[in-house]
Every structure is written in C-alpha cells, then in structure tokens.
Interface confidence: low
C-alpha cells in the first residue's frame, strides 16, 4: 500500500495473507468460513510450493493470539483467467477446515448487485504489499482510502486505453495506491467487498495508471458455484 498508514489491529477481520512457503505472497479476503477469495495470478509461479492462508493477523512476524495458518485443501482459479490478461483474475482457496471465527476472524459480505460503485465513493484497500518504490515490505497491515474512478476516465488512451471491461473497476492512484503484494486483497466500499486487487506489473502511485480491481458482483454466479 503506497501513501497509506498502518491499519488498526484486527479491525479488518476478513483480511487474509496468502503465503507461499511461509512468506507473504498476496492478499486475500475471507468470504465464507472455509473460503478465501484472492487473485488467480498470485499462484502462477507457485509451482510445487506450499500455499497456506494466514488469518487473524496484523503483524506477519509477531505472535498474536488470533493468528492461525491454514493449509489449502483446494485452489480454484477462475476458469477463464490467463497469464497474459487482467481479466477474470480471481482465485478461491478452500481452507483445510472451517476457520475458527472470532473478533479477529470473520467473513466479509460481498456485493452481489451487479451495478457500478458510484465514482468518487471512498473505498478501503488493505494489504501487506510494498509501501514505497524501493520495495519495502511492511510487517503490519497497511490500508488506504481511495476514491472510485469512473470507467470512461480509466479507459482513456493515457490511462488504461480501453482495457477496463464492465467486470473491472478502477480507483484513483495519485500517490495513494495498492501495489505489489497487495494483489488479491479486498477493496471494501460501505462495509461490503466490491473489488479484488488485480495482480500484474502495473506501475503504482501514478495518477495516470489507476488501480484496477476485479468486481466481485460480476462473478457472483461463479463464486456461488464454487462455494456450493
């Protein structure tokens, strides 16, 4: 997270760290007792590594009573996700068992009404991604509030040049932005999960390259079919 600040500890009980061989790889969001939603591209280079999900965490390194690392029973990338596009960049991870819920671990309601969030709406994005252009990784969860950007502006030739389909949304990126390591994390508007940070090599913090988020409402049928 660029230009943000440390989050209040455990105030985002839905927040997950998707880990590869014990190290933070991507963000994720608990959407059901046994399911975490993240970004498909996160597992592209996982190969034979051990993928796990950390829940109830604020600090990645310090012991916390609510922290628990879960093995992954099943990883379900969206069937249409492809390495070279940002489209359909969603991944559902089934935990090895139902998460133990509590004040620091709780699923987040996700948006099902397939309607764009109004431009200018302030949404919260959180993650353990890099906090500066030098690539410094934080130990504790960071967050930032970002205004939603209308699709027409986001699709300008100087911005994302038509790449933002109706299944994607954008948020402003002027010095405050999500970045590498935040992929798969939640974009939360009005207490509801609206978007998932897309993974990719987008430049962060540049106002002409807005943050891109997968709209979960556009994938409600797929999410339901996997969780059923």
């Amino acid at each position: 997270i660029l230009g943000g600040r440390e989050a209040e500890a455990h105030a985002r009980p839905y927040m997950a760290s998707v880990q590869l061989n014990g190290a933070h790889l991507c963000g994720g969001v608990l959407v059901a007792e046994q399911w975490v939603l993240s970004a498909a591209h996160c597992l592209e280079d996982a190969a034979d590594g051990k993928v796990q999900v950390l829940l109830g965490a604020h600090s990645l390194s310090q012991p916390e009573p609510s922290k628990r690392l879960y093995d992954v029973l099943r990883a379900v990338p969206h069937p249409d996700s492809q390495p070279d596009t940002i489209d359909h960049d969603l991944l559902l991870l089934q935990l090895s068992e139902k998460a133990t819920l509590g004040p620091a671990v709780r699923p987040l309601p996700w948006q099902r009404v397939d309607r764009d969030v109004a431009p200018g709406t302030l949404c919260d994005v959180a993650g353990w991604g890099i906090v500066n252009h030098a690539g410094r990784r934080p130990d504790s969860l960071q967050h930032v509030l970002l205004p939603v950007l209308d699709r027409a502006t986001c699709n300008r030739r100087t911005h994302h040049d038509g790449a933002i389909t109706e299944r994607l949304m954008c948020a402003e990126s002027n010095r405050r932005d999500s970045c590498k390591g935040d992929s798969g994390g939640p974009l939360v508007c009005g207490g509801v999960l609206e978007g998932v940070v897309t993974s990719g090599s987008r430049v962060c913090g540049n106002r002409k390259k807005p943050g891109i988020y997968t709209r979960v409402a556009s994938y409600a049928a797929w999410i339901d079919s996997v969780l059923a």
Epitope: P109, W110, R112, V113, G191
Partner: antibody, heavy 122, light 107 residues
Framework: EVQLQQSGPELVKPGASVKISCKAS????????MNWVKHSPEKSLEWIGD????????TYNQKFKARATLTVDKSSSTAYMQLKSLTSEDSAVYYC???????????????WGQGTLVTVSA | DIVMTQSHKFMSTSVGDRVSITCKAS??????VAWYQQKPGQSPKLLIF???TRHTGVPDRFTGSGSGTDYTLTISSVQAEDLALYYC?????????FGGGTKLEIK
C-alpha cells in the same frame, strides 16, 4: 421499492402439505438470498432456511431440513416454500425475507413479506 | 445452535425515557447481532445489524452496542410509536437464531 408479496392464508389437515409463494419486486431477484422464517407464539422467530435464487442452492436449519423444500421460479421472481407432514405445531405465520445488500446472510433480513398464516387442524 | 436469550419479556417505559433492551448469546457471536422491531399486525423491521449499524431510514434514537455474548438495543428518547416487540438475532453462523422478544409497553 422492494416488495415481497406472499400468498394467502392456508387451512390444512394434519399430515398434509402446504406450499407458500413469495413474489418479489422492486429489486434484482437473483441478487439476494431469500430466507424463510416461522413465527409462532411458543417459539418466537425460527429461521427455516434460505435459497440462492441465482443458483437454486439451499441452506436449511437442521430442524426443518427433512420437511421443508425451498424453490424459486426466476422467470416470475417468485420463491416458494413447501412444508410437508404437517402437525398442529406447524400452525404459525410464515415469512419470506431477503438479506440486505449482500448475498451472504450475514447482515440480517432487511425486507419481509406480509406473512402467510398456516393453520393445521382436523 | 446458538441460543439468544432476551431475559425481559416485557418492559414498561414512558415517552421521553431512555430504555435499554438486552440480549445474551450462548456463545461469543463476535458482534454479529441484528435487532428487529415488530409492531402489532406488521412484519418485523430490521433496525440494526453488526451490533451498531443502523439500517436505512432508522431514526438515530435507536443505537446498538455490545460484544462477546452481551448486546443491548437502546432507545434514547422513547416515542409512542416505539411501542412494539423487539427481537435480537445472531448473524454469526447458521442456523440464524432469534431471541424470544421483548415487548416494550408505554406507561
């Protein structure tokens, strides 16, 4: 304006079945789970189960699982609850209710039908 | 199943008074509690969810608080139209369960 219009009162005999309808309007029917709730003076409010109108997927309260069947007709934006093998204890008002802004039933039931009175009597 | 207990079946109050209706869960429900108001002859109406978030259009005299197993609905200045049954409900895990209700009576 969100509206849930339920079918009228039913007088049924013990051992019979009843099927109640709930017609939704004013919102995208498939975007919200539909819940069914039993209201009796003895047991207060009891959640029977819910159905995802988009997929037809159901979750039942174990207490009602053997006797309740939830279905939807997407073309008419109508949800149905069938209750079989009725006894006098099933005499109650039955409500349909949708969840608030999220398909997950985490945040309570924001919109309710007017209720359907079912009386089980010989 | 999680049992929600509203120990007071009836509460008597006067217009303008402050009143608190309590609800106790049989286990920690992690602030996942909603409150409903049901007036005679009407369907229940959602007032509050996630312990303290007011539903659209609910007057700000209604506030919710609590954590763990203990939750409270407070009406800061009771109005005559607040005469009703009030139910708590946990939305922590299925099956969603309700309290037995508290009937608010106006003296």
């Amino acid at each position: 304006e969100v509206q849930l219009q339920q079918s009228g009162p039913e007088l049924v005999k013990p051992g019979a079945s009843v099927k109640i309808s709930c017609k939704a309007s004013g919102y995208s029917f498939t975007a919200y789970y539909m819940n069914w709730v039993k209201h009796s003076p003895e047991k207060s409010l009891e959640w029977i189960g819910d159905i995802n109108p988009s997929t037809g997927g159901t979750t039942y309260n174990q207490k009602f699982k053997a006797r309740a069947t939830l279905t939807v007709d997407k073309s008419s934006s109508t949800a149905y609850m069938q209750l079989k093998s009725l006894t006098s204890e099933d005499s109650a008002v039955y409500y349909c209710a949708t969840t608030y802004y999220s398909g997950n039933s985490y945040v309570g039931f924001a919109y309710w039908g007017q209720g359907t009175l079912v009386t089980v009597s010989a | 199943d999680i049992v929600m207990t509203q120990s007071h079946k009836f509460m008597s109050t006067s217009v303008g008074d402050r009143v608190s209706i309590t609800c106790k869960a049989s286990q920690d429900v992690s602030t996942a509690v909603a409150w409903y108001q049901q007036k005679p002859g009407q369907s229940p109406k959602l007032l509050i969810f996630w312990t303290s978030t007011r539903h659209t259009g609910v007057p700000d005299r209604f506030t919710g608080s609590g954590s763990g197993t203990d939750y409270t609905l407070t009406i800061s200045s009771v109005q005559a139209e607040d005469l009703a049954l009030y139910y708590c409900q946990q939305h922590y895990t299925t099956p969603w369960t309700f309290g037995g209700g508290t009937k608010l009576e106006i003296k």
